[in-house]
Interface confidence: low
């Protein structure tokens, strides 16, 4: 009876997400059969988040809109480990928008989800950011320094990375 009601709850939760994500990939968390964490198919998962690499080229704002339609945001990178995971799925000859911008051009960088910007956990390429008119951040590959961040003009179309919390059912 308990298992039945749990299954009914799961199904209704899945229906909720179906309008955005017709297919979810779920894994059992730990040893408890009750706890499943899911990411939309074909998103990738790391710790408590799901990630999607959007290969369509759009401006920063349009990229953020594209993520938000899917219930996500442009990616907020909180740790070196998270960045190391993300770059495994990126192409070296491409650039990808992050959820980091400086709307006023005053070097007040801010993350889209209001996570405080911590100068100690940033991965700018050396010499970056370097232009007050370049108010959006990308991650790209430079042969000398591998993967890092760069500031660019927000209207220049780029690929992007979306991030959302895992769905727990």
């Amino acid at each position: 009876n308990f298992m039945y009601s749990k299954t009914v709850k799961r199904l209704s939760k899945l229906r909720e997400y179906q309008q955005y994500h017709p297919s979810l990939t779920c894994v059992m968390e730990g040893k408890d059969i009750e706890d499943w964490s899911c990411c939309p198919t074909p998103w990738t998962s790391f710790q408590s988040s799901c990630y999607f690499i959007s290969t369509g080229m759009q401006s920063w704002t349009k990229s953020q809109k594209n993520c938000s339609v899917m219930g996500a945001d442009l990616v907020v990178i909180n740790t070196r480990e998270e960045q190391d995971f993300i770059i495994q799925n990126l192409k070296r000859n491409s650039s990808y928008f992050l959820g980091l911008s400086d709307p006023g051009g005053r070097r007040h960088w801010q993350w889209v989800d209001q996570t405080p910007y911590n100068e100690n956990v940033t991965f700018w390429h050396s010499g970056e950011p370097n232009n007050l008119d370049e108010r959006c951040a990308i991650i790209n590959f430079r042969s000398s320094e591998e993967w890092g961040w760069n500031d660019i003009h927000c209207h220049v179309p780029q690929k992007s990375i979306c991030k959302m919390k895992k769905i727990y059912i």
Partner: nanobody, 125 residues
């Protein structure tokens, strides 16, 4: 259908003030980022000011910083642009614009989904 209607334009002398209003007819007003742009005859459209959905954040174009103030009134679904110490170079048609993604407010006119018809502001002695 979202509609934006500007008002409050007119002719003033240098150093005087004007207040532009933009009425937004949509139930989703509180989720829109809003902006003002202007276009002088023969020139490109220029970013003036923008405000985030909550009204907590505002951004101003370099040429109006310290003189113009943008605010919004959620219950009235209105956006305002208070323009003080006006200069002849402020003469232009002023447009109100709305962006569906209220969390972002860049001064890029390509990003705004809705536009008003504009109101003329002339600063002349």
């Amino acid at each position: 259908q979202v509609q934006l209607q500007e008002s409050g334009g007119g002719t003033v002398q240098p150093g005087e003030s004007l207040r532009l209003s933009c009425e937004v007819s949509t139930d989703t007003f509180s989720s829109l980022a809003m902006a003002w742009f202007r276009q002088a005859t023969g020139k490109d459209r220029e970013f003036v000011a923008a405000i985030s959905w909550s009204g907590a954040s505002t951004v101003y174009g370099d040429s109006v910083k310290g003189r113009f103030t943008m605010t919004r009134d959620h219950p009235k679904k209105m956006v305002y642009l208070q323009m003080d110490n006006l200069k002849p170079e402020d003469t232009a048609v002023y447009y109100c614009a709305g962006d569906l993604d209220g969390r972002t407010w860049h001064g890029d006119d390509l990003e705004y989904d809705y536009w008003g018809q504009g109101t003329q502001v002339t600063v002349s002695s």
